[in-house]
Every structure is written in structure tokens, then in C-alpha cells.
């Protein structure tokens, strides 16, 4: 049977004085020699040597110094051997217990925290937390952590409230005002015993977050400008306000805007986001003859919702502002700026000459009458095809054009008149499109196989050729209707998709017949005019050569019929 | 692989104090203890005492107690072995010796190449 | 302290042939975490020691499956079962059961 006793150690002092701290006998010892051995951590394993052990008593000794933070206890395993180096016990698992001693301050896990509140915070509300250990015995005084504000920066009323075991930063009161103090440092102190044993100190930052519970308010209490009528501005006015909320933050941003006066939409406010300034922008001219003073209202207001500390207490506050409109000799304008003309449909490109379109006259803007003592010309004029009259302002074409005209775009063309006053010289412009129909002066024309045909079989083939491949096959081929007191002479009958055959439906007497095919193609496109065909029908020999041509004067030219004209 | 080298060979006169240093390759320095052995000419092998790295807390024979140091230097992975009050008796070949268990530590399963040290007036 | 002593002193073998080298210990090896630390080396002429067995019987790595180990409590064998010419030199047990460690005093293995 093991008998045992073992004195607990306190760290950081000399125990041996104490010594022996520990004593194992085996009761074996009575009536054999019995060697003791002890083993563990602070013996045979690392920190080597702190115990030993008198084989022979089995007291036990201690030689170092031991730190209770490193080594709470020790377990010491005991053995009692015999003579023959055999265990006479059972090992012994032996227990020495370090006392702790105060060697260790508490330790913040920051040196410097940081945190953050919105001005006028209910009070109690929380900044942070502290957090620091001690690593001094858990749950003895030794360890037990009191924290303490030291100091507030700035000094005066105490703003923040420490809780003495948790570490909580708190607000004291409701009243943080971020436009008197916009960051507050604390030293806060943490001392173990509760308070009365080591500390150490660590700083707290805190920053009082702006709220938007400031007005931003007009510097002066009415504004004035004036601006001549007819003209815009991008700077007529700067409304200066003052805003105590933090600066280019959307609490001290303004939003200016009208209260009265700007039903027409002429001004604009826009904010300067640097100065949060308001700048005043004429948008819309302004016509003295119809205003010649606007009285304004304007109101601010913040980009951001006021906070709801003080959104009770917002009232739209409007201050007024007087802008003299200045009158101004206007002269002449065109009014509407642009006109259309069209051009009406079924005339020939070949035939615009002189094809007056209307007439564009300038305005008086003082009296809004047509202007007179003015002088019309004409402007930009690609191509040359208009013409105004200076005094009328009639316009007319004065060339002709060709279909495919570079000028005309999306079937308009393009040109400026000007009119001038006689007495400024002061010109005013006015924009003229016109718009011209399709004129299929490339429509497809039509061809035929030969040019003289037997006057006993007379047949020929007519094949259609296009110039700009604008029209596509395949083709229709028609007579142009005739007169319906002449019987119908000639025929035609589609062959393929570009020709056709013509032929006359009785015999004919000899001579040069003129006949009219009308050529429409598959989009519907047909020619502004009919195809004139001119064929020779002559009295051929046995071999089927013309034979004596036939005077031209008689019987004469004929068309589609001998002796009869259109 | 695992490597202890030792400084060289050195003279000291009776009285004065050796320092024999070893260092350790691989990245478990602080893993292992570390002993010191020292072998008379012509003599058996002689336990000097063991360091643990990682606290530095150390454990000498008897017979060396008093006269012995052992330290180490964490940073360059170094041992050293200091002895005091040399007399001829403490010529020998000093080994320094790492243990193959992180534990118990109680084989020495690498050795250094031995370090010569001769006290003679 | 812990004595260790080592029969023979001196082994004079025939190339070979197997080889015995016992060691006892004044009192018993077994350690409290149950272990037994006994080991043995080799330690050629001029050269450092180097370690053969561990913990009675475990082959270091490297070493030749002819060397072998046994025994308990205070007593020991290192056993050779073919001496080759490389196996010339001094051999050790080494008790690490407590502090302070101990050696043997040697056992010279030559060949006859």
C-alpha cells in the first residue's frame, strides 16, 4: 500500500526551502529495500529536472522555479521496485498542484479599437466591445478583469459609459453631435484583481457618423438677375447655402427645385457638387413680348431624407427670385425653322423645270407677321436645282434631275434659304426639304430581234433590257391600250421572262409602224412613259428579203394601224 | 534527412570552459530533444545531459551538475554544450545526439560527427 | 543511477557465423508509459555511433535484418545471425528508462 502526501507549489518563487514538497513510501518497506523512480513532465519530460526523488526515502524534491502558466499541475508517476528491479506497487499517479501568483496583466487583443455611432444615438446604445484576457488563473481574482474610461478626448461631459466587467462601450446620453465632435478617443484602462491589481491601457477610436438632422439653408433672403429675352444660360444665378451636416456626403448635398413661378419650364437648378452651390440655367428662352419679369420661388432640401430627428421641424421655406427679362430687336426668323415641299407625283424628272413649289416666307418675330424689307437667296443648294425669288420667297426648280441624283436622300433632297434684313443685314435661315417621287427614268426598254419584218408573216421578238438592274424580271409586256374606235392590229405574247412575241393579228400593209409596250416588272415598277417600238413591215420576194422600200411619205409613218396616227 | 554538424576540433587549457556547438538541418528543430555524450580516448560512451528545444529546460548527470550548460539558439537552429573548470579529464570527443521520437525522446537515433576537445597545459 | 553491464567484453567470431552479446541492468527498464528503453549500437573505429535496435527489439532504419533484439525487464541480448566483415567494432546497450541515461561498457566484436 502506497503512502503519500503532496504540499502544492506557488509559481515564481523558491519552493525548495520546502522541501521535501512530496513523499511516496510503499508499505513493502517494513521488510525489503524498496528504490523509488518517479517519471513524467518536469522529470524525464520536458522542462526536464524539475523534481527528483531520494531512491532510497522517496522524498521528493523540487529544484526550479515553476511557472503556473506554462504548467498548471503536475503528474508525477511514482514506482516502488524491489530488490530484482521488479514493481512492487501499482504505479502512483501523484498530483502537485501550482499555486498561481498575480505575475501577468491583462492584455488587450487591440492596442487601438475602433468604432463607429451615428450622432444622436438613444443613450445606451452600443460602440463596441473591449476585449482582453489575463492569463492568470481562469476564474480567480488574479484574472478577473475591471475596465475604466481614463481619459475622453475632447474632455467635458462624458459621452461614454464602460461596463466595469463586460468591456462595453455605451453611449451616456442621446445627445453625440457629430457638428460639435466628429471622433472621440478614450483611454481605457483594464486591471486585474478586479481592478486593484496589474492593468494595462489601450485606446478606443470612435467616430461619430454624420446624420442628416441639419437644414441646408439660403445665405441670403431673395436673389435677382436679369437676362435679355431669346437666349439661353448655363449660369445666370449661384444660390450660395449653408449646410452644417459632414460635407460631399448626401446629408449636406442640396437638391434645389421651384416652389412657383417656372410653369413654362424655362429655368433649371442644377447643384454644383463642389460648392453645393445651385446654379440657375435658363433652358428655355424667354420672350419679352409675352414676359418681361418672372418672379421665382425656391426651396433646398438635401439629397438625403432629413433624419427623423428633426424632420418634424422641416418646413419648405421658399425664397424669391426676380429675373428682368431685357428686350432685345429681334429681327426676322423662319417659323417653323424647316418646311416640306413635295413634289407632285406623275411629273418626269425631265420636266421640273420652272415646277414651282411653294413659297417660305421669314417672319417679323417683334410683330409675328411676314417680314418685309427683307431679301430672300438661297442657302446651301447641292446640285442647283432651287431658286427662291427675293422678294416673294417663291421657290421653283430651275434645272432638272436625274433619278439617281446624289442629292436625293431617302427621296428628299435637301437645301437653306436665307432671308435677309435690308436694314441689319442680320440673316436668318430656314431649311427646305423637298420631297420627289420615283422617277423611273431607268425603267427597262425594250428591244426587238430585227427591225423589218414581212409584210405576209408579220412576227417579231421583243426582249426587255434593264440599264441599273433596279428592276428585276420577270417581265409583263403590254400594248398600250389604243383608241376603242380602232380595231386592235398587233398582239403580244409572253415568251420567257424577259422577251415576248409581237406580231400583227391580220395582214398589213407595208410601211413603219410605231407601237406603244407598256413593260411592268415583278415589284409593280413600270415605266412613266410607254416604250415607243418602231418596225419596219415590208413586201418581201420568194427568198424572204425586203424588196423596194416604199416612199416615206406615203402611206406615210404609221402607228399600230396604215393611216391612222394617235 | 536529418543532420547534426558540429564545430571543430579546439586546445583549452585546465581551468578554462569549452563551448562545442551543433546544428540541426530539417524544420523540426523544436520537435526533438537533443543529448550530449563525450567519449574518453580509448574509453565507453558517457551521458551528459539532454535539452528540450522548444523551452529550453535542460536535465545534466550528476557528476556534470555545476559545470555544464546547455542552451540553444532557436533562430539558426543551433545547440551548444559549454563546459566549465576543464581538466584532463574532460578530453574526449563530445557528440552531440537527437532522438527519433517527438515525445518521450528517448532514442538517440542521429549523431553528430563528434567534436575533439583537448585540455592540456 | 541505473548500472548497465555488458558479457563479453571482447567477441572474437569467425566470419559467418552468428554472434551474442547480452546486457543487464541493475534494476528493471520498464518505464510507467509501459515501454522499455533499451537500445543498442555500433560504433566503428573513428567513427560516431550509430543506433542498431530500440525499445529492445525495433530495427533502426537501414540496418540489416541480421541484427536482432530481445530480452525484458533487466535483461538483454543483441544477436547477429552472419558476422560480416563490416560488423567490426564497439558495441553499446543504452538504457533511457530514467535519467540519468547509462551506457554499457562495450563489447568489441573482432573477427578471429
Known amino acids: 500500500e502506497w503512502v503519500k502526501f503532496a504540499k502544492p507549489c506557488r509559481e515564481g518563487e523558491d519552493n525548495s526551502k520546502r522541501n521535501p514538497i512530496a513523499k511516496i513510501t510503499s508499505d513493502y518497506q517494513a521488510t525489503q529495500k524498496i528504490t523509488y523512480r518517479i517519471s513524467g513532465v518536469g522529470i524525464d519530460q520536458p522542462p526536464f529536472g524539475i523534481f527528483v526523488v531520494d531512491k532510497n526515502t522517496g522524498d521528493i524534491n523540487i529544484t526550479a522555479i515553476v511557472d503556473r502558466e506554462e504548467t498548471p499541475s503536475f503528474l508525477i508517476t511514482c514506482r516502488a521496485l524491489n530488490a530484482q528491479g521488479l514493481d512492487v506497487e501499482k504505479p502512483l499517479i501523484l498530483t502537485v498542484k501550482i499555486l498561481d501568483i498575480n505575475d501577468n496583466p491583462p492584455v488587450f487583443s487591440q492596442q487601438i479599437f475602433m468604432g463607429e455611432i451615428e450622432e444622436n444615438s438613444a443613450s445606451n446604445s452600443l460602440v463596441m466591445i473591449l476585449n482582453a484576457t489575463d492569463a492568470d488563473e481562469p476564474n480567480h481574482l488574479n484574472s478577473k478583469i475591471a475596465f475604466k474610461i481614463v481619459s475622453q478626448e475632447p474632455a467635458g461631459t462624458p459621452m461614454f459609459l464602460l461596463s466595469r466587467n463586460t468591456g462595453e462601450v455605451r453611449t451616456l446620453t442621446n445627445s453625440l453631435d457629430r457638428e460639435q465632435a466628429s471622433s472621440y478617443r478614450l483611454v481605457v484602462s483594464g486591471a486585474d484583481k478586479d481592478g486593484e491589481g496589474l492593468s494595462t491601457q489601450c485606446e478606443c477610436n470612435i467616430k461619430v457618423k454624420d446624420v442628416n438632422d441639419n437644414f441646408p439653408m439660403f445665405r441670403d433672403s431673395q436673389y435677382s438677375a436679369r437676362i435679355e429675352e431669346n437666349i439661353l444660360s448655363s449660369e445666370l444665378l449661384r444660390f450660395q447655402v449653408t449646410d452644417l451636416d459632414e460635407e460631399y456626403t448626401d446629408n449636406w448635398l442640396a437638391v434645389y427645385f421651384f416652389t412657383s413661378g417656372n410653369e413654362g419650364n424655362w429655368f433649371e437648378i442644377q447643384t454644383d457638387p463642389r460648392t453645393n452651390e445651385g446654379i440657375l440655367k435658363v433652358v428655355k428662352a424667354l420672350d419679352y413680348e409675352q414676359l418681361q419679369s418672372v418672379k421665382l420661388s425656391i426651396a433646398v432640401k438635401n439629397k438625403a431624407e432629413f433624419h427623423q430627428s428633426v424632420i418634424s421641424r422641416y418646413r419648405v421655406q421658399s425664397t424669391p427670385v426676380t429675373i428682368q427679362v431685357i428686350n432685345v430687336r429681334e429681327g426676322i426668323a423662319f417659323r417653323p425653322a424647316s418646311k416640306t415641299f413635295t413634289v407632285q407625283k406623275g411629273i418626269s424628272s425631265k420636266k421640273l423645270v420652272d415646277y414651282i413649289l411653294g413659297t417660305y416666307q421669314a417672319i417679323d418675330e417683334d410683330t409675328n407677321k411676314a417680314a418685309s424689307n427683307v431679301k430672300y437667296v438661297m442657302g446651301r443648294n447641292d446640285g442647283g436645282y432651287l431658286m427662291i425669288d427675293s422678294k416673294t420667297a417663291e421657290i421653283k426648280f430651275v434645272k432638272n434631275m436625274n433619278r439617281d441624283s446624289t442629292f436625293i436622300v431617302n427621296k428628299t433632297i435637301t437645301a437653306e434659304v436665307l432671308a435677309i434684313d435690308e436694314y441689319t443685314g442680320k440673316t436668318s435661315t430656314g431649311t427646305v426639304y423637298v420631297r420627289v417621287p420615283d422617277f423611273n427614268d431607268n425603267c427597262p426598254t425594250a428591244v426587238l430581234e430585227k427591225d423589218a419584218v414581212c409584210s405576209s408573216s408579220p412576227s417579231v421578238v421583243v426582249s426587255a433590257r434593264t440599264l441599273n438592274n433596279r428592276y428585276t424580271g420577270p417581265y409583263t409586256f403590254a400594248l398600250e391600250d389604243q383608241p376603242v374606235k380602232l380595231p386592235a392590229v398587233w398582239s403580244i405574247t409572253t415568251l420567257n421572262a424577259t422577251s415576248a412575241l409581237l406580231r400583227a393579228q391580220e395582214q398589213i400593209p407595208p410601211g413603219v409602224y410605231h407601237i406603244s409596250l407598256v413593260l411592268t416588272d415583278s415589284q409593280n415598277n413600270r415605266c412613266e412613259m410607254p416604250r415607243s417600238l418602231t418596225l419596219e413591215v415590208c413586201q418581201c420576194d420568194n427568198r424572204g428579203i425586203c424588196g423596194t422600200s416604199y416612199p416615206t411619205t406615203s402611206p406615210g409613218t404609221r402607228y399600230g394601224r396604215p393611216h391612222s396616227g394617235r | 534527412q536529418v543532420q547534426l554538424v558540429q564545430s571543430g576540433a579546439d586546445v583549452k587549457k585546465p581551468g578554462a570552459s569549452v563551448k562545442v556547438s551543433c546544428t540541426a538541418s530539417g524544420n523540426t528543430f523544436t520537435t526533438y530533444s537533443l543529448h550530449w555524450v563525450r567519449q574518453a580516448p580509448g574509453q565507453g560512451l558517457e551521458w551528459m545531459g539532454v535539452i528540450d528545444p522548444s523551452g529550453g529546460s535542460t536535465s545534466y548527470a550528476q557528476k556534470f551538475q555545476g559545470r555544464l550548460t546547455m542552451t540553444r539558439d532557436t533562430s539558426t537552429s543551433t545547440f551548444y554544450m559549454e563546459l566549465s573548470s576543464l581538466r584532463s579529464e574532460d578530453t574526449a570527443v563530445y557528440y552531440c545526439?537527437?532522438?527519433?521520437?517527438?515525445?518521450?525522446?528517448?532514442?538517440?537515433?542521429?549523431w553528430g560527427q563528434g567534436t575533439l576537445v583537448t585540455v592540456s597545459s | 543511477d541505473i548500472v548497465m553491464t555488458q558479457t563479453p567484453l571482447s567477441s572474437p567470431v569467425t566470419l559467418g557465423q552468428p554472434a551474442s552479446i547480452s546486457c543487464r541492468s541493475s534494476e528493471t527498464l520498464v518505464h510507467s508509459d509501459g515501454n522499455t528503453y533499451l537500445s543498442w549500437l555500433q560504433q566503428r573505429p573513428g567513427q560516431p555511433p550509430r543506433l542498431l535496435i530500440y525499445?529492445?527489439?525495433n530495427r533502426f532504419s537501414g540496418v540489416p535484418d541480421r541484427f536482432s533484439g530481445s530480452g525484458a525487464g533487466t535483461d538483454f541480448t543483441l544477436k547477429i545471425s552472419r558476422v560480416e566483415a563490416e560488423d567490426v567494432g564497439v558495441y553499446y546497450c543504452l538504457q533511457a528508462t530514467e535519467f540519468p541515461y547509462t551506457f554499457g561498457q562495450g563489447t568489441k566484436l573482432e573477427i578471429k
Open positions: 525499445k529492445i527489439s
Open positions: 545526439a537527437r532522438s527519433i521520437e517527438s515525445i518521450s525522446g528517448r532514442t538517440l537515433g542521429y
